[in-house]
Amino acid sequence: GITSINCSGDMWVEPGEIFQMGMNVSIYCQEALKHCRPRNLYFYKNGFKEEFDITRINRTTARIWYKGFSEPHAYMHCTAECPGHFQETLICGKDISSGHPPDAPSNLTCVIYEYSGNMTCTWNTGKPTYIDTKYIVHVKSLETEEEQQYLASSYVKISTDSLQGSRKYLVWVQAVNSLGMENSQQLHVHLDDIVIPSASIISRAETTNDTVPKTIVYWKSKTMIEKVFCEMRYKTTTNQTWSVKEFDANFTYVQQSEFYLEPDSKYVFQVRCQETGKRNWQPWSSPFVHQTSQETGKRNWQPWSSPFVHQTSQTVSQVTAKSSHEPQKMEMLSATIFRGHPASGNHQDIG
């Protein structure tokens, strides 16, 4: 930028230094040089001399015209060619910007992640504006009528300490930039209805060596919420389609879920929970990969036409023994957790 340029004249922009992308723009340069009657006035955009659509209005002033200016940012400056001077003389410069007014923010969502101490609100900003755009989040108590406002760029975290006076709120977002202002639809929020339970984690899995082997998945959460509804999705790593099973969970103890799965296959498991009867889900947990045991030679495996699952509190010890005549067949492969950062949202897919 050129905030501290010393001008020997003036430069101005019509319709203004920030304007709607695609508009026709006129930029004027007026010299006020001492001891110079300029032969020519020149315009530069981002350091490159412009050749076309320049009009000399009078002895001191020239204009350059751009049809449908569509660059988000440009640095313009103008110079004078003074008789007897080897170099051009700087007159003035300006940063110009083009962009769009904001769209109305959409899909406003507010949640409280358990133990976070914050209400987190997110929204879709719409199409890019290309210029500085701020979002004002309005939080109005439906009980006291008091309104709080928070400035944000893309989301906001509001301390629940500042939401002590009430449980019911009206929330909306105002998008503001130099070219316009739009409001989102209003969201009715009850603080007790937007809590997302503390993250659910699959801690381990094991496959038994029963006549019909079963896989037990162990999962837990530090939530203090009593009634929690969960989904566990699972698939082989080669499959595109998830199977989903539903559970009512009580996290005062580690959850155990039994699955009857195909042998000698690598499975991916993920879990997510919500407070029973509420709307907001946790994001899916990190993918947990487990390899089921190979078949024994004695058993003719008949895969279930539809794998079924149920929960049990029965304890099953992890298989470590190996058959003496087929040592490699019963060996357990240890489960591993991918510790990457899966995509956010509830539609995270694993290859």
Epitope: I136, Q148, Q149, Y150, L151, A152, S162, V176
Partner: nanobody, 116 residues
Framework: QVQLQESGGGLVQPGGSLRLSCAAS????????MRWVRQAPGKGLEWVSG???????IYADSVKGRFTISRDNAKNTLYLQLNSLKTEDTAMYYC??????????GSQGTQVTVSS
């Protein structure tokens, strides 16, 4: 009831600086977003700048890079630092609740005059 008292205005030459203050009472200042608006002679009210309770700020294009809004929650006071003043900054300056908008709630204001 809500009370806002502006001060710090005066006569200053172009290029000069001033610091405006707004003393607040009658509401929970630390939880309340605030703004400055101004009214030039013969013109309508113009929003200048806003700040939320956490200190995030927003400015009108006409003052960006020259004015700085800030707050001291311990003193229940809002500030506006005016630098590189221009003649077109001459106006009555008012503080108000809320981060954005070209209205104010009837406080007395403080006069800023920029003239050589």
């Amino acid at each position: 009831q809500v009370q806002l008292q502006e001060s710090g205005g005066g006569l200053v030459q172009p290029g000069g600086s001033l610091r405006l203050s707004c003393a607040a009472s009658g509401f929970t200042f630390r939880l309340t977003a605030m703004r400055w608006v101004r009214q030039a002679p013969g013109k309508g009210l113009e929003w200048v700048s806003g700040i939320d309770s956490r200190g995030s700020t927003i400015y009108a294009d006409s003052v960006k890079g020259r004015f700085t809004i800030s707050r001291d929650n311990a003193k229940n006071t809002l500030y506006l630092q005016l630098n590189s003043l221009k003649t077109e900054d001459t106006a009555m300056y008012y503080c108000a609740q809320g981060v954005y908008g070209d209205t104010y709630s009837g406080s007395q204001g403080t006069q800023v005059t920029v003239s050589s």
